[in-house]
């Protein structure tokens, strides 16, 4: 499996779109900032075999896609940017799925690192709960946007390390 330069461009475009989606000054949202306890250790990538790392990355993209494709999300963000964001995420998920299929035959270890996948799921549950508690306010969405931008940049760095291993 080769996470190509095209995939790397997808990552950069995804981050760029996330940056463009900002609709409110973060300086007016300091009261709403929140620590979502991003599971950083799952993205360090050293302890993982490739198939496991890819499955964690895929889960991250899938959960991000789910979060931003809700009705509440559609109301919060610019429709055109959101559509572009979906396309980029969808493309990245396809690339990762292709990699997962290839890697299964190569490695004898279980495909899914259950604990890592669960950590990512719980992280997104914390984000969803926060949005509900804040009644999907503009500031809550801005805080979440900033958080997802950071987590996507961790994902991008892990993918870079995987590419270097190829």
């Amino acid at each position: 499996c080769n996470l190509s330069q095209t995939h790397s461009l997808n990552n950069r475009r995804t981050l760029m779109l996330m940056a463009q989606m900002r609709r409110i000054s973060p300086f007016s949202c300091l009261k709403d900032r929140h620590d979502f306890e991003f599971p950083q250790e799952e993205f360090d990538g050293n302890q993982f075999q490739k198939a496991q790392a890819i499955s964690v990355l895929h889960e991250m993209m899938q959960q991000t896609f789910n979060l931003f494709s809700t009705k509440n999300s559609s109301a919060a963000w610019d429709e055109t940017l959101l559509e572009k964001f979906y396309i980029e995420l969808f493309q990245q998920m396809n690339d990762l799925e292709a990699c997962v299929i290839q890697e299964v035959g190569v490695e004898e270890t279980p495909l899914m690192n259950e604990d890592s996948i669960l950590a990512v799921k719980k992280y997104f549950q914390r984000i969803t709960l926060y949005l509900m508690e804040k009644k999907y306010s503009p500031c809550a969405w801005e805080v979440v946007r900033a958080e997802i931008m950071r987590s996507l940049s961790f994902s991008t760095n892990l993918q870079k390390r995987l590419r270097r291993k190829d």
């Epitope: 463009q20 000054s25 009261k31 900032r33 929140h34 620590d35 979440v144 950071r150």
Partner: antibody, heavy 123, light 112 residues
Framework: EVQLQQSGGDLVKPGGSLKLSCAAS????????MSWVRQTPDKRLDWVSI????????YYPDSVKGRFTISRDNAKNTLYLQMSSLKSEDTAMYYC????????????????WGQGTSVTVSS | DIVMTQAAFSNPVTLGTSASISCRSS???????????LYWYLQKPGQSPQLLIY???NLASGVPDRFSSSGSGIDFTLRISRVEAEDVGAYYC?????????FGSGTKLEIK
Amino acid sequence: EVQLQQSGGDLVKPGGSLKLSCAASGFTFSSYGMSWVRQTPDKRLDWVSIITSGGSYTYYPDSVKGRFTISRDNAKNTLYLQMSSLKSEDTAMYYCARHAEGGGNYDYAMDYWGQGTSVTVSS
Amino acid sequence: DIVMTQAAFSNPVTLGTSASISCRSSKSLLHSNGITYLYWYLQKPGQSPQLLIYQMSNLASGVPDRFSSSGSGIDFTLRISRVEAEDVGAYYCAQNLELPFTFGSGTKLEIK
């Protein structure tokens, strides 16, 4: 290696204007918020302005609001501080600083600083 | 604005012994999210400030573990367990809880 190279400091008369620059290298400049902080002759640190990574949002304390303008050119990896209607109390060493990536907890720690550029306002 | 208060000088310390530097804020820096938005910076003679501690107790990258920080939300202490000659300089506390961000006036570490 992260580097912030500053320039533009000078001696100016009260009421005058000056533009400071901060050229960034060694990191993806467009992904980070930036600030200007000044150090007065009595060695106090005084935060002057902040700008978001994309440059759309800024904030200033009352002491400089309406006189100072922070801006950035992400294509040139450069941060600017346009200062006008300068007063003697603006005399200081001016530092540009990068903000650590904070995510949803908005951590505005300043993890890298420029070498500073000296501004003296005197007649 | 939140006012950060520091003593101008620390008690003189001998190299190899421990030192403490205090800082007080005019308002609690503990956010409802559980994070205390208190920071420590060190400015060595002739240099730019550098980040030492973020969010009250976390060591910045590359900072030796001789440094530690604790506090209550209003009163904060920076500790250096074994002072070295290179630790000399001015230590500034700062808050990022509210805008405008504010700094303490700085405490100079004095060596006996």
